[in-house]
């Protein structure tokens, strides 16, 4: 988790002088509780936005927006703590809005936004806005939290972000898989414009099972420049196992920008349709 590299983060607006500060996620009001504390944020909304860094890179960001309740507690509102928690790693990043002037009621509801938390593709977050000072122990909570899901790199807008492009999101291998005679599969895919090797991972399964019955790995050497964007054709030999008929072909590239961690593409071949008429049952049963 990090903040987008903007020169100065701004939270001031007409009628309010405000500054954005880094925060340890442990506001002073936790340690020194105040008697009078503001009410919680209203209508917290988190949206996926996209922003450029000063270097021109495009990143997904969490756009956080909320409003204030129209009660007298805004007279005691000194700021807000914004927290983004990555759910699995428990990594947390916070910033603090510090109000340098007192809020007053005006004809419009006060609205705040912040769009500088960089988020990762395919990750899950909890976003919390805490009004400051935080409540006394056992006081009514004055925060609001929302869960937030960032799409993966297959999402149209995500695909062109810097982290997705670095993991190979622009490569579309257009995989085709064809079943041949003699227990073989022909795999065809489009090479990318980089002289890097690929790996084909074949996993086969029985018709309705999820436990594999055959696995095979095939290495494809780095193509020459004249082969970039051309189709690569590979024939894989299958294990002759009855019922081991559903095949998943996964292609793993090793681009220089993502090495072992590039996006993989896969295609699946289903088992052939079962005939409607059942097989005749033999009039004797083997004993083995």
């Amino acid at each position: 988790l990090r903040l987008l590299d903007h020169r100065a983060l701004v939270c001031s607006q007409p009628g309010l002088n405000c500054t954005v500060k880094n925060s340890t996620c442990l506001d002073d009001s936790w340690i020194h509780p105040r008697n009078l504390t503001p009410s919680s944020p209203k209508d917290l909304q988190i949206q996926l936005h996209f922003a450029h860094t000063q270097q021109g890179d495009l990143f997904p960001v969490a756009h956080i927006e909320w409003t204030l309740q129209t009660d007298a507690s805004i007279l005691y509102l000194e700021g807000a703590e914004l927290s983004v928690l990555q759910l699995n790693t428990n990594e947390r990043l916070c910033v603090r809005f510090e109000f340098l002037s007192k809020l007053r009621h005006h004809h419009r509801r006060w609205r705040f936004t912040f769009s500088h938390f960089v988020v990762d593709p395919d990750q899950e977050y909890e976003v919390t806005v805490h009004h400051l000072p935080k409540p006394i122990p056992d006081g009514d909570p004055n925060h609001q939290s929302k869960n937030f899901l960032v799409p993966d790199c297959e999402h149209a807008r995500m695909k062109v972000t810097t982290p997705c492009m670095s993991s190979g999101s622009l490569w579309d291998p257009n995989i085709t898989v064809e079943t041949l005679e003699a227990h073989q599969l022909r795999v065809s895919f489009t090479l990318w414009n980089e002289s890097t090797h690929y790996q084909i991972l074949l996993t086969s399964f029985p018709h309705m099972e999820n436990h594999s019955c055959f696995e095979h790995m095939h290495h494809i050497p780095a193509p020459r420049p004249e082969e970039f964007h051309q189709r690569s054709n590979v024939t894989l030999t299958l294990r002759n196992l009855k019922g081991c008929c559903r095949h998943q072909v996964q292609i793993q590239p090793f681009f220089s920008s993502c090495l072992n961690d590039c996006l993989r593409h896969s295609a699946t071949v289903s088992c052939p349709e079962m005939p409607d008429t059942p097989e005749p049952i033999p009039d004797y049963m083997p004993l083995w």
Epitope: N90, N147, L149
Partner: antibody, heavy 116, light 107 residues
Framework: QVQLVQSGAEVKKPGASVKVSCKAS????????ISWVRQAPGQGLEWMGW????????NYAKKFLGRVTMTTDTSTSTAYMELRSLRSDDTAVYYC?????????WGQGTLVTVSS | DIQMTQSPSSLSASVGDRVTITCRAS??????LNWYQQKPGKAPKLLIY???NLQSGVPSRFSGSGSGTDFTLTISSLQPEDFATYYC?????????FGQGIKVEIK
């Protein structure tokens, strides 16, 4: 190929405990949390909570607080869900699933029957 | 807790039909909604996440739309393997909650 394989069916008496395991393969274990969802016979899905495979942090549904414990073993890429003080209405299929908010891969389910 | 209500409770359709299933949240979940398919005796399978994003490997005949409180799952041309129960699930607010499910049956 991402796979979550759960332990086998269990029959328990009321008041007993059950511990269901969920072994993952095909991905980096600490990259995604594990959620637990249950489904009573003929009923819908009920979220029980989740555990961070990275930090061990847990988040339980209020209904199960005090009765459920979720743990993980990083060395074997296995998650566990223990439910105590079982009652007959805990009879259900218990599923583990990868991730926290969108449950993209699921175990095959473990049927827990609570009967005297 | 947020209540998720699906309608209709069940529906009958034929192969090739366009099928629409709706899900309503008791309060806004913005786009924090997933759709799952479950066949008898099997675990649920994720179809759509974040209201409209197609999960990898799911056929493109499935699509999702909506935001706020009203959401729709559409199957553009029903296939034999699509006869199943469909659940919506909101994830914006804790605890995560599921709809009661809608069974799509063969007419």
């Amino acid at each position: 190929q991402v796979q979550l394989v759960q332990s086998g069916a269990e029959v328990k008496k009321p008041g007993a405990s059950v511990k269901v395991s969920c072994k993952a393969s095909g991905y980096t274990w600490t990259s995604y949390g594990i959620s637990w969802v249950r489904q009573a016979p003929g009923q819908g899905l009920e979220w029980m909570g989740w555990i961070s495979t990275y930090s061990g942090n847990t988040n339980y549904a209020k209904k199960f607080l005090g009765r459920v414990t979720m743990t993980t073993d990083t060395s074997t890429s296995t998650a566990y869900m223990e439910l105590r003080s079982l009652r007959s209405d805990d009879t259900a299929v218990y599923y583990c699933a990868r991730r926290v908010l969108r449950l993209d891969y699921w175990g095959q389910g473990t049927l827990v029957t609570v009967s005297s | 807790d947020i209540q998720m209500t699906q309608s209709p409770s069940s529906l009958s359709a034929s192969v090739g039909d366009r099928v629409t299933i709706t899900c309503r949240a008791s309060q806004s979940v913005h786009t924090g909604l997933n759709w799952y398919q479950q066949k008898p005796g099997k675990a649920p399978k994720l179809l759509i996440y974040g209201a409209s994003n197609l999960q990898s490997g799911v056929p493109s005949r499935f699509s999702g739309s909506g935001s706020g409180t009203d959401f729709t799952l559409t199957i553009s041309s029903l296939q034999p393997e699509d006869f199943a129960t469909y659940y919506c699930q909101q994830f914006e607010h804790n605890p995560l909650t599921f709809g009661q499910g809608i069974k799509v049956e063969i007419k």
